[in-house]
């Protein structure tokens, strides 16, 4: 009886998401088989979120307004290790836009779900940020400094990196 | 290349506005922030504020606060700067910069002489 | 607001000098050091950008360095077109700010 409604639960909760992932892949958290922790198909799964890499190419506003409708938000980059993951599944060739924008051009930079713009754990290229004009962070790669960050105008498409909380279940 | 052309030398009476204008060539002009310095009779360069040619909002030095407003016109390229309130000590040489990399202003225009008497 | 201070108001140089001038913040300024010659006739062109980079058709003899709060501008061969005032200026914090010039004449 008590597995009976614990299924009906999971069963309801995953119609919830079935409008925006109409599939998801789940695996079981640690020995207990009530714990199932799920990303969308064919998301990653890093730590307690999901990834999602976006080639299509959009402005910064649109890349947001693109992840919000998947009930994420562009990626916003908390560790190194979380950065060092994120970046096994990006092309060299390619700039993506993050969470990070400077709004009012005052070098005043935040994380789209507020989370505090802490200097101690950026990871911006050599002489960047640079630009008062250049109000969006994107990450890419310079051979000389591998993955970093870098400053752009918000306008000019870019892929982008969508991050969810995983799904419990 | 790249040309910043001002508007020429005004003379104004106390209490009055002026407004100057700077309009930029040779480059796209809504991809380039404009700064504005002013630089009184003998003295040094001072840093007015910055307006962002694609969204239209602007950074003031506290200082010039109240007396100082900066629009921009995209259609004609051209970026403007009134100043209200005029008094004696409002007479300057005003330029305009165009915003570049690495926090800098990498072309200026040739400077309003803007003098205040009545 | 950021302090910037050129401790030489004026400077008297034979053509062909080497000609040093300085310039320092009131705190660090990571490099966002730029400087600006002024014509006597008015006219202000960028010399050198975030400390020690050379704006496009400048000259050679011209070069900058420095770090954290102290920075300095070069002239290797004094020329007849280098009599000017030399600003420095801090890009590293708004509002921006200017050091009070140096005035570099020929002796």
């Known amino acids: 009886n008590f597995m009976y409604s614990k299924t009906v639960k999971r069963l309801s909760k995953l119609r919830e998401y079935q409008q925006y992932h109409p599939s998801l892949t789940c695996v079981m958290e640690g020995k207990d088989i009530e714990d199932w922790s799920c990303c969308p198909t064919p998301w990653t799964s890093f730590q307690s979120s999901c990834y999602f890499i976006s080639t299509g190419m959009q402005s910064w506003t649109k890349s947001q307004k693109n992840c919000s409708v998947m009930g994420a938000d562009l990626v916003v980059i908390n560790t190194r290790e979380e950065q060092d993951f994120i970046i096994q599944n990006l092309k060299r060739n390619s700039s993506y836009f993050l969470g990070l924008s400077d709004p009012g051009g005052r070098r005043h930079w935040q994380w789209v779900d507020q989370t505090p713009y802490n200097e101690n754990v950026t990871f911006w290229h050599s002489g960047e940020p640079n630009n008062l004009d250049e109000r969006c962070a994107i990450i890419n790669f310079r051979s000389s400094e591998e993955w970093g960050w870098n400053d752009i105008h918000c306008h000019v498409p870019q892929k982008s990196i969508c991050k969810m909380k995983k799904i419990y279940i | 290349q790249v040309q910043l052309q001002q508007s020429g030398a005004e003379v104004v009476k106390p209490g009055a506005s002026v407004k100057i204008s700077c309009k930029g060539s040779?480059?796209?002009?809504?991809?380039?922030?404009m700064h504005w310095v002013r630089q009184a009779p003998g003295q040094g360069l001072e840093w007015i504020g910055v307006?962002?040619?694609?969204?239209?909002?602007?950074n003031y030095n506290q200082k010039f606060k109240g007396k100082v407003t900066m629009t921009v016109d995209k259609s004609s390229s051209t970026a403007y700067m009134e100043l209200s309130r005029l008094t004696s000590d409002d007479t300057a040489v005003y330029y305009c910069a165009r915003n570049g990399n690495f926090y800098v202003m990498d072309y200026w225009g040739q400077g309003t002489l803007v003098t205040v008497s009545s | 607001d950021i302090q910037m201070t050129q401790s030489t108001s004026s400077l008297s140089a034979s053509l062909g000098d080497r000609v040093t001038i300085t310039c320092q913040a009131s705190q660090d300024i990571s490099n966002y050091l730029n400087w600006y010659q002024q014509k006597p006739d008015g006219t202000v062109k960028l010399l050198i950008y975030y400390t020690s980079n050379l704006h496009t058709g400048v000259p050679s003899r011209f070069s900058g360095s420095g770090s954290g709060t102290d920075y300095s501008l070069t002239i290797s061969n004094l020329q007849q077109e280098d009599i000017a005032t030399y600003y420095c200026q801090q890009g590293n914090t708004l509002p921006w700010t200017f050091g009070g010039g140096t005035k570099l004449e020929i002796k």
């Open positions: 307006i962002s040619t694609y969204y239209g909002d602007s």
């Open positions: 040779g480059y796209t002009f809504t991809d380039y922030s």
